[in-house]
């Protein structure tokens, strides 16, 4: 069954890992998403008003992804970013960003996912988002659009 | 050289890790993979009949990426899914999903790939299969079209 | 803060991981990395002229993205290569690969992204590079194009 | 100028098998998918088959799937065509001809290497 | 499959006169028809793509129309070098070309 894990056997402490999934109530940015029902993972991280917040510092595995759809293809650019803040420094800092510009054919139901994955160092009480340009194109199907991170 | 992996000399238990690449003789859903020969890495999971099977309950980070491609753009409906099947559940389980809808212009030579990758809690006699819309659509080089995960 | 690993506390070695971000003075292939400011993480592995060489011998998660875009769409085929070169071997190894054609509007200002990730097992003194088909056509912002591995 | 120049043509016994070439100048090679195309004596025009600018795809017409195969070499700017079990079906000129820009017609051809296959 | 069927099979006409060669689809291709000249024993010329848009190179009493189903080849002042054999192609679905066209002097 897939869902909140058990601590792997191996280990003595518990593993730091989030699988978050679309959340279709999203009304603004940043996204919102689903951390209890379906396949979600949150252990170890918290899940505060859209965004991951680390509790250790340390380097993690960070990944996105995003599905864009619509009925009539108008081209208008998109954009999927992950992004981190931190009560420390005054700006976001966008980490990984994805951007599509001329992607379909005017007119035309459309539909495209966007990819985003790497490794980062990350500081306790920092806390990670996504952002999209054109919320009313987002599909939050769990297995179509979610977020994630674990722990080296 | 990239092949079969000796176990990691810091560990001692072996690393499960699987990378099986593209297999043209595929013929049905879902796909089949090359478990032997080439960059294929296969180690403490089992692959059967185009699946990969859980033998320990964990956390996977389990990936994909399949290279769609045509002669003549006529923007076929495009889908990309890993899922799950465990004999104690009755129906499949999609964990990942990528579609792509209008992505070619009419009558050009086209390519176009999906990812994806993420993290979820797998069970011991989880099967983790691949599936595609249009198998006639996939080149399956090794470096193109592939499969895998690891244990966190 | 985003910066350079301090080795994860519970852990004695170093971690193995490397996330280079774009560098706008790539003048030919493979493309060159920044090693140094910004989000980058460079620890137990060395960078040499665009490459991440590897010192120990064990299986790595590799990764890249690379941020493609043009004022004006001609559909000229993308490529992007993650590949390996060792000097026991003649050859060039193409471990992972992204292609695109026909993926924009003939005229249009556009842009796209080509991810890849997998695992392979890597052996001490490989050297991984990236190649990309239209170096013109490569946006180098650190949040766009990236290149990375960590050691499992 | 862009030439493409076919070799290899013959006469050939049903059953048998014939290699075409197709040396290419003028023009940068690797960068352009080739076809063949053929026309049979008296006939019109039938694609044959496509292979991509980097040979990593290769299509072919549902009458030569299976029997004919398509191939190139960038280092020799030259394009080839291996075709086995031939038929007398298979009788005529083959031409190979570049591709505009990955839009599946074509924009300079060869001069033509006929292919007889007959008892 | 789609099916291109050009008419006429064969056209008598004389220096000078206005020529048009028409080529059906047996479906919509939209505006992807390509036109070829060809000459006894010798390669296909390429002359127009994308229904009505004219190759470098190819004389501007050529031209192209149509869309959908129907598409046309007009010689709007035929010239000696003018009388060979004209195929249309479309590439909207894989590849298919007409029958040929063959453009005699009267």
């Known amino acids: 069954q897939i869902g909140h894990p058990s601590p792997p056997p191996e280990k003595k402490e518990l593993r730091k890992v989030a699988h978050l999934t679309g959340k279709s109530n999203s009304r603004s940015m940043p996204l919102e998403w689903e951390d209890t029902y379906g396949i979600v993972l949150l252990s170890g991280v918290k899940y505060k008003k859209g965004g991951l917040v680390i509790n250790e510092t340390g380097l993690y595995f960070v990944y996105s992804k995003v599905y864009f759809r619509g009925q009539s293809c108008n081209n208008l650019p998109l954009s999927h970013k992950v992004y981190m803040r931190n009560s420390k420094y005054p700006q976001d800092l966008v980490m990984m960003e994805g951007k599509m510009m001329s992607y379909c054919t005017t007119g035309q139901m459309w539909a495209r996912s966007s990819y985003l994955g790497a490794v980062f160092n990350l500081t306790s009480a920092d806390h990670l988002y996504v952002n999209v340009s054109e919320l009313s194109l987002v599909n939050f199907e769990e297995s179509q659009t979610f977020f994630g991170l674990y722990k080296l | 050289q990239i092949g079969h992996p000796s176990p990691p000399p810091e560990k001692k238990e072996l690393r499960k890790v699987a990378h099986l690449t593209g297999k043209s003789n595929s013929r049905s859903m879902p796909l089949e993979w090359e478990d032997t020969y080439g960059i294929v890495l296969l180690s403490g999971v089992k692959y059967k009949k185009g699946g990969l099977v859980i033998n320990e309950t964990g956390l996977y980070f389990v990936y994909s990426k399949v290279y769609f491609r045509g002669q003549s753009c006529n923007n076929l409906p495009l889908s990309h899914k890993v899922y799950m099947r465990n004999s104690k559940y009755p129906q499949d389980l999609v964990m990942m999903e990528g579609k792509m809808m209008s992505y070619c212009t009419t009558g050009q030579m086209w390519a176009r790939s999906s990812y994806l990758g993420a993290v979820f809690n797998l069970t011991s006699a989880d099967h983790l299969y691949v599936n595609v819309s249009e198998l006639s659509l996939v080149n399956f080089e090794e470096s193109q079209t592939f499969f895998g995960l690891y244990k966190l | 803060q985003i910066g350079h690993p301090s080795p994860p506390p519970e852990k004695k070695e170093l971690r193995k991981v490397a996330h280079l971000t774009g560098k706008s003075n790539s003048r030919s292939m493979p493309l060159e990395w920044e090693d140094t400011y910004g989000i980058v993480l460079l620890s137990g592995v060395k960078y040499k002229k665009g490459g991440l060489v590897i010192n120990e011998t064990g299986l790595y998660f590799v990764y890249s993205k690379v941020y493609f875009r043009g004022q004006s769409c001609n559909n000229l085929p993308l490529s992007h290569k993650v590949y390996m070169r060792n000097s026991k071997y003649p050859q060039d190894l193409v471990m992972m690969e992204g292609k695109m054609m026909s993926y924009c509007t003939t005229g249009q200002m556009w842009a796209r992204s080509s991810y890849l990730g997998a695992v392979f097992n890597l052996t001490s003194a490989d050297h991984l590079y990236v190649n990309v088909s239209e170096l013109s056509l490569v946006n180098f912002e650190e949040s766009q194009t990236f290149f990375g591995l960590y050691k499992l | 100028q862009v030439q493409l120049v076919e070799s290899g043509g013959g006469v050939v016994q049903p059953g048998r098998s014939l290699r075409l070439s197709c040396a290419a100048s003028g023009f940068t090679f690797s960068t352009y998918g080739i076809h063949w195309v053929r026309q049979a004596p008296g006939k019109g025009l039938e694609w044959v088959a496509v292979?991509?600018?980097?040979?990593?795809?290769?299509f072919y017409a549902d009458s030569v799937k299976g029997r004919f195969t398509i191939s190139r070499d960038n280092s020799k700017n030259t394009l080839y065509l291996q075709m086995n079990s031939l038929r007398a079906e298979d009788t005529a000129v083959y031409y190979c001809?570049?591709?505009?820009?990955?839009?599946?017609?074509?924009?300079?051809w060869g001069q033509g290497t006929l292919v007889t296959v007959s008892s | 499959d789609i099916q291109m069927t050009q008419s006429p099979s064969t056209l008598s006409a004389s220096v000078g006169d206005r020529v048009t060669i028409t080529c059906r689809a047996s479906?919509?291709?939209?505006?992807?028809l390509a036109w070829y000249q060809q000459k006894p024993g010798k390669a296909p010329k390429f002359l127009i793509y994308?229904?009505?848009s004219l190759e470098s190179g190819v004389p501007s009493r050529f031209s192209g129309s149509g869309s959908g189903t129907e598409f046309t080849l007009t010689i709007s002042s035929l010239q000696p070098d003018d009388f060979a054999t004209y195929y249309c192609?479309?590439?909207?679905?894989?590849?298919?070309f007409g029958q040929g066209t063959r453009l005699e002097i009267k």
């Open positions: 479906q919509s291709i939209s505006s992807w």
């Open positions: 994308q229904a009505s």
């Open positions: 192609q479309q590439y909207n679905s894989y590849i298919t």
């Open positions: 292979i991509w600018y980097d040979g990593s795809d290769k």
């Open positions: 001809a570049r591709d505009r820009d990955n839009w599946n017609y074509f924009d300079y």
